[in-house]
Interface confidence: low
């Protein structure tokens, strides 16, 4: 698809970790756009042939989604318009660990940021009352 804007936009990610078997969040924010229809979000994972997730024209576009992520991903569709491109990853697997790219296109331009995602059997911190 074509790029309507010529400038780069700021995209920000935060390294995070996911507990195997639970749901995880890959955090990504960007400079918001006025029109949802002008926003494209692509999540990619290095070493994976297809996409992790794509959201464009206000809805998910999953025809190129890689099999290893099938049925396990979602963006927060109601928050995209305010610049939240974070990805919810269901049932985190050991093999989900790696480098992800959050790639954004808006009418203002395009931008991307990488995110290191770690997976494991992380224990919850104990809370003493």
């Amino acid at each position: 698809f074509g790029i309507s804007g010529r400038h780069s936009i700021t995209v920000t990610t935060v390294a995070s970790a996911g507990n195997i078997g639970e749901d995880g969040i890959l955090s990504c924010t960007f400079e918001p756009d006025i029109k949802l229809s002008d926003i494209v979000i692509q999540w990619l994972k290095e070493g994976v042939l297809g996409l992790v997730h794509e959201f464009k024209e206000g809805k998910d576009e999953l025809s190129e989604q890689d099999e290893m992520f099938r049925g396990r991903t979602a963006v927060f569709a109601d928050q995209v318009i305010v610049g939240n491109a974070s990805l919810r990853l269901k049932n985190v697997q050991l093999t989900d660990a790696g480098t992800y790219k959050c790639y954004i296109i808006t009418s203002k331009g395009k931008g991307n940021a990488n995110l290191e995602y770690k997976t494991g059997a992380f224990s919850m911190p104990e809370v003493n009352v």
Epitope: G47, T95, G98
Partner: antibody, heavy 116, light 107 residues
Framework: EVQLLESGGGLVQPGGSLRLSCAAS????????MHWVRQAPGKGLEWVAS????????YYADSVKGRFTISRDNSKNTLYLQMNSLRAEDTAVYYC?????????WGQGTTVTVSS | DIQMTQSPSSLSASVGDRVTITCRAS??????VAWYQQKPGKAPKLLIY???IRESGVPSRFSGSGSGTDFTLTISSLQPEDFATYYC?????????FGQGTKLEIK
């Protein structure tokens, strides 16, 4: 049973063309990316090309770029490799393989010999 | 392009031996490395993916380790059926690249 079956290999003269096919069965073909990998006689494995599940992403090795075309027909559960302007160095066993973390399912291979 | 340098290129060992094959990437490939076994006249078989995860049905004597640039395939106790050629492969980025192979022979 998950299976890949290549066909279409044979003897061809330099400059000639061949089309290889890879018939998939036992899994949802349309959900997986696919690869072609080749192995020259007595040599190691060489990646040739890859295609994503719905053909939106296609990649080639420099050695075949502009001469080979990877494609797929999800309605027929079949992967293709169109090989044009063949050279002696293209002589190899050609394997199709399913894309996963690595290549988790391989066909038995089909032999391509380029010789005058 | 990312080069995968495998060593040794050949190795003689006996049944029951512990064998280690190494693979070094020319730049970091995170944990996007697979190991394959190939026997003469046969297609390669996936043994290990994501550097250390054993493929379903692969015996536990096969293990993989490493991340970044240095990777290892270990066979803890060689069995007669393990004599074959082994390849590492990176799937971190295209072009996908393989090591040159390690031929494991009976001593």
């Amino acid at each position: 049973e998950v299976q890949l079956l290549e066909s279409g290999g044979g003897l061809v003269q330099p400059g000639g063309s061949l089309r290889l096919s890879c018939a998939a069965s036992g899994f949802t073909f349309s959900s997986y990316g696919m690869h072609w990998v080749r192995q020259a006689p007595g040599k190691g494995l060489e990646w040739v090309a890859s295609i994503s599940s719905s053909s939106g992403y296609i990649y080639y090795a420099d050695s075949v770029k502009g001469r080979f075309t990877i494609s797929r027909d999800n309605s027929k559960n079949t992967l293709y490799l169109q090989m044009n302007s063949l050279r002696a160095e293209d002589t190899a066993v050609y394997y199709c393989a399913r894309a996963s973390s690595g290549m988790d399912v391989w066909g038995q291979g089909t032999t391509v010999t380029v010789s005058s | 392009d990312i080069q995968m340098t495998q060593s040794p290129s050949s190795l003689s060992a006996s049944v029951g031996d512990r064998v280690t094959i190494t693979c070094r990437a020319s730049q970091s490939v995170s944990s996007a490395v697979a190991w394959y076994q190939q026997k003469p006249g046969k297609a390669p078989k996936l043994l290990i993916y994501a550097a250390s995860i054993r493929e379903s049905g692969v015996p536990s004597r096969f293990s993989g380790s490493g991340s970044g640039t240095d990777f290892t395939l270990t066979i803890s106790s060689l069995q007669p059926e393990d004599f074959a050629t082994y390849y590492c492969q990176q799937y971190y980025s295209t072009p996908l690249t393989f090591g040159q192979g390690t031929k494991l022979e009976i001593k």
